[in-house]
């Protein structure tokens, strides 16, 4: 760092709001796509290069001039597993968080020409190559089609698709957002023989309706209608099918074989929550009751003599929770051994920490292969000898992430592959393995600048640095950058972690205004070792504001005692803990306790509003962006996971006493900025509209901003710049900054 300890003597520029909004300082990524066990693709100057992992040499896989005459702007590409074809995506139109429609063309890499016959239709909703070869499955108008060869006609698999009613092979709104985190509801078998798919029926699901104002010339706004089950409302139903793609013919309809949910699920509302192929002819399905504390895994085998799928009751595995819900957000996926007779899965152990358990398909009980007062984040690869996983074990820091390998023949032999590679710079890793896990890319995202490296699994040797962000490092040497502190406080004999983005030349003898940046939803984590350039960087660097985040009760990756503390009680402990954190920060000596603010988005907007409405006297002001205001307004899958049903027999009382509106009177004591996008399909504008009405009804003066036609992300270029500029002004005014 070129600067001195004295802020006045440091002539370097600060990180400004414009720097954030214009992305002046860009973090360089190294996004690779593995195409085999030793080769990956990487896009450089719009050429697609193929790299040899072992030696690092590359050749041009596809020149950037190949599609000069294409006539469309290519949004994305996908190469068939056999390397013979490339799928080009264009005319991208966003729908919800993951979903979109697009047009597609297929380029034959051998013939070096576009395939012009039997093209995939425009407005296709999802396309995917088979795992081997070059079959294609796609969804168009809510129906599934399969192409055996890119130039052959499509075989229609389903005929029942209907907009907003029946979804074949794609998710409806709530399954996309809350269950699969994807638009796709198609699963190819490993060799591409079978195609499994879900069918969702939203016939009885109520519609959310909101206006979309569009261009100024539109005289009457459009009404957007989306089947969206709110808490306690009628849910979508689901069916599951498998079709054999070898048996498809255009002169007869495809036969899809249904696999029904277990009897223990059919007794009431339920969800399909995971689909994993174990072998070519074995599939595992996980089902979850609407009351999400009970799930069942079915393991189903193909019976060649009947063409049907059999799921033996003896192979069912039940996962339940007595203290909360199953999984972090849903039951974790199984990782099957090659023979499909056993699998590894992250589940909660007796102490309530999430660890890896080894299951044999015919046995009920499993053997934990990891243990401790830390959690396994994810299983990343499984070979015949090792299982690779990411955990936050190292140095007892829940906000860290490292890659480990465990020997399957001796579970005591565990090696951390990343811990000591660059311990000052790198404490938060993710990983990308080659097809058979012979090589892996480590992606370090903090606390230092991101670092991308390539490694061999044979000896866990580092092969080369792929990207070290040295150019950015050089640029940032000339900027007064904030520092990041990650630490914990102890409340009721429990460690709770927080992070602080501290202004340059931070002096603990001085008093700084503090902004609490909150999310605080179940299984959230805001205190971590990740390096970020964001709004907080500006606030700390230019405005000398401390930006803090705190992981209280309900937060994740520290065991179920903390996470399940808010079960059936959203809006209680997680809200109280943010207030307590601010009190604790006040006592640290460097916080101006007359200038403490809070802000959050989505769940964070809810917590911000609940905090400001608590009458604690701790906060001067706050900003809530796209907040939840009453849990009956939010979707069923998310809400009921934590709150149960809004019925008198279940948890209606707490639904009713956890609203922002009921705290309206207390907003007279604070300055409040309420912001929402009018086209928010997720947290509906309704939620802020009701806060606004309640505040007006009790005579509270507050500030508000809506963003016309913006969704939950408020992410269009102009809106993004506007909201952060507007919030900056509000915070500066609140803190009496020039």
């Amino acid at each position: 760092n070129k600067g001195t300890d004295d802020a006045t003597a440091d002539s370097r520029k600060t990180y400004t709001l414009t720097d954030y909004l214009k992305n002046t300082y860009r973090l360089k990524l190294y996004s690779l796509r593995w195409i085999s066990d030793h080769e990956y693709l990487y896009k450089q100057e719009n050429n697609i290069l193929v790299f040899n992992a072992e030696y690092g040499n590359s050749s041009v896989f596809l020149e950037n001039s190949t599609f000069d005459e294409f006539g469309h702007s290519i949004n994305d590409y996908s190469i068939s597993p056999d390397g013979q074809f490339i799928l080009l995506e264009y005319n991208y139109v966003k729908q919800w968080r993951h979903s979109y429609t697009a047009s597609y063309d297929i380029y034959d890499l051998n013939k070096r020409q576009l395939i012009t016959e039997e093209r995939i239709p425009n407005n296709t909703q999802w396309v995917t190559w088979s795992p081997v070869g070059h079959k294609l499955a796609y969804v168009w108008n809510n129906d599934i089609y399969v192409k055996i060869e890119p130039n052959l006609p499509s075989y229609r698999i389903t005929w029942t698709g209907k907009e907003d009613i029946i979804y074949n092979g794609i998710t409806d709104w709530v399954y996309e957002e809350e269950v699969f985190s994807a638009y796709s509801a198609l699963w190819w078998s490993p060799n591409g023989t079978f195609l499994a798919y879900a069918q969702f029926n939203d016939t009885e699901v109520p519609l959310i309706e909101y206006s979309f104002y569009s261009d100024e010339s539109l005289q009457y706004p459009k009404t957007v209608r989306v089947p969206y089950p709110k808490a306690g409302a009628v849910n979508p139903t689901v069916k599951f099918f498998v079709v054999n793609t070898d048996s498809l013919s255009s002169v007869t309809n495809a036969t899809s074989i249904q696999i029904t949910a277990p009897a223990s699920m059919l007794i009431g509302d339920h969800y399909l929550c995971d689909v994993t192929w174990a072998t070519q002819e074995r599939i595992s399905l996980q089902w979850l009751r609407r009351i999400q504390n009970y799930s069942v895994m079915d393991i189903c085998d193909y019976d060649e003599s009947s063409g049907r799928w059999n799921c033996l009751v003896a192979r069912q595995h039940i996962e339940m929770s007595t203290t909360g819900w199953v999984g972090r957000f849903r039951p974790s996926e199984p990782h099957f051994t090659l023979d499909g007779n056993s699998f590894y899965k992250i589940i909660s152990n007796e102490e309530g920490y999430r660890h890896i358990c080894y299951f044999q398909i015919d046995k009920k009980d499993c053997t934990f292969i990891t243990k401790g007062t830390w959690e396994v984040i994810g299983i990343e690869a499984l070979t015949s000898d090792y299982l690779y996983y990411i955990s936050n074990e190292y140095k007892g820091m829940p906000g860290g992430r490292n890659l480990y390998k465990i020997q399957l023949s001796d579970y005591t032999k565990v090696t951390c592959l990343s811990c000591e590679l660059n311990p000052e710079r790198c404490q938060y890793y993710s990983v990308s393995f080659s097809k058979e896990a012979k090589y892996y890319q480590l992606r370090c995202s903090g606390p230092g600048l991101p670092l991308y490296t390539l490694h061999s699994s044979v000896n866990d040797k580092g092969l080369r640095v792929l990207e070290d962000n040295s150019a950015l490092d050089k640029m940032l040497q000339n900027v007064q950058m904030p520092s990041k502190k990650l630490d914990f406080i102890i409340l009721n004999e429990t460690k709770f972690w927080y992070q602080m983005i501290l202004p340059p030349h931070f002096d603990k003898s001085k008093k700084y205004p503090l902004l609490l940046d909150v999310y605080a939803g179940p299984c959230s984590q805001k205190a971590d070792t990740v390096f970020r350039l964001n709004w907080a960087t500006y606030l700390a660097s230019t405005e000398n504001i401390i930006v803090a985040s705190f992981d209280g009760r309900g937060s994740g990756y520290q065991g179920d005692k903390i996470m399940h503390a808010i079960n059936r009680r959203l809006g209680t402990f997680e809200v109280e803990d943010q207030i307590e954190a601010a009190r604790q920060f006040s006592k640290m000596g460097f916080v101006d306790n007359k200038r403490i603010a809070i802000w959050g988005w989505s769940y964070g907007g809810y917590v911000t509003s609940m905090v400001l409405g608590s009458g604690s006297g701790v906060f001067k002001c706050g900003i809530a962006v796209a907040p939840v205001s009453r849990w009956e307004y939010y979707d069923s899958v998310y809400t009921e996971r934590y709150m149960g049903l809004p019925t008198p027999e279940d948890n209606l009382d707490h639904y009713r006493n956890s609203t922002v509106m009921s705290r309206a009177e207390n907003f007279k004591q604070v300055e409040y900025l309420l912001i929402h996008g009018t086209a928010d399909d997720n947290v509906h504008f309704q939620q802020s509209a009701q806060i606004s009405k309640a505040l007006v009804d009790v005579g509270v003066d507050f500030q508000a901003m809506w963003y016309t036609d913006e969704d939950h992300g408020i992410a269009s270029s102009t809106a993004h710049q506007h909201i952060y500029t507007h919030m900056s002004h509000f915070i500066k005014q609140c803190f009496s900054l020039p």
Epitope: E117, N151, P153, N244, D246, S249, S250, T252, T255, G307
Partner: antibody, heavy 116, light 107 residues
Framework: EVQLVQSGGGVKQPGETLRLTCTAS????????VHWVRQAPGKGLEWVGV???????DYDAAFMSRVTISKDTSKSTAYLQMNSLRAEDTAVYYC??????????WGQGTTVTVSS | EIEMTQSPSSLSVSAGERATISCSAS??????LNWYQQKPGQAPRLLIY???NLHTGVPARFSGSGSGTDFTLTISRLEPEDVAIYYC?????????FGSGTKVEIK
Amino acid sequence: EVQLVQSGGGVKQPGETLRLTCTASGFSLTTYGVHWVRQAPGKGLEWVGVIWGDGRTDYDAAFMSRVTISKDTSKSTAYLQMNSLRAEDTAVYYCMRNRHDWFDYWGQGTTVTVSS
Amino acid sequence: EIEMTQSPSSLSVSAGERATISCSASQDIRNSLNWYQQKPGQAPRLLIYYSSNLHTGVPARFSGSGSGTDFTLTISRLEPEDVAIYYCQQSNKLPLTFGSGTKVEIK
């Protein structure tokens, strides 16, 4: 290796019933359809019908009333039964595996002669 | 039903020369056309599927083209082992129908 082995041909009397057998190996009859065609001496190929992987059947209208195609998946065998045989049913009968919209494997053929 | 008409009914071409067989459908069958080769005393075998796609193991001298109602099978350089009867077959609609065949001989 995919194979279709046919049996059951021979000389038949008019009015009799014919039952031909097509035994499959190297693939499953629950996955692939089996078609039957015939070829009269010195003539072209004539489609008779099909039994699909799921057991559904389709026939040419000319044979609908007197042909039944069936299968026993446990024996990996498909059958063609033709009633009320007449002289013009004299032909070589072939079974074939349906691969999407074409026939990629054929049986060796079995000769049926209808004569009094 | 869809009628398939093949022409010529027989064709005599010198070895090494090009042989062209036509097949026309009585209605639009898009590209749903297959070609089979039958040698004396043998079962037919698949040459080309879906108008222009060469089946595995078929020599590259065979090619197919066409769509809609008119299709062509071409043998670029006739070899002695190509002597056979060639049939087209539509797979667009049931009932499936075949052309009457074209006998190819060496001149």
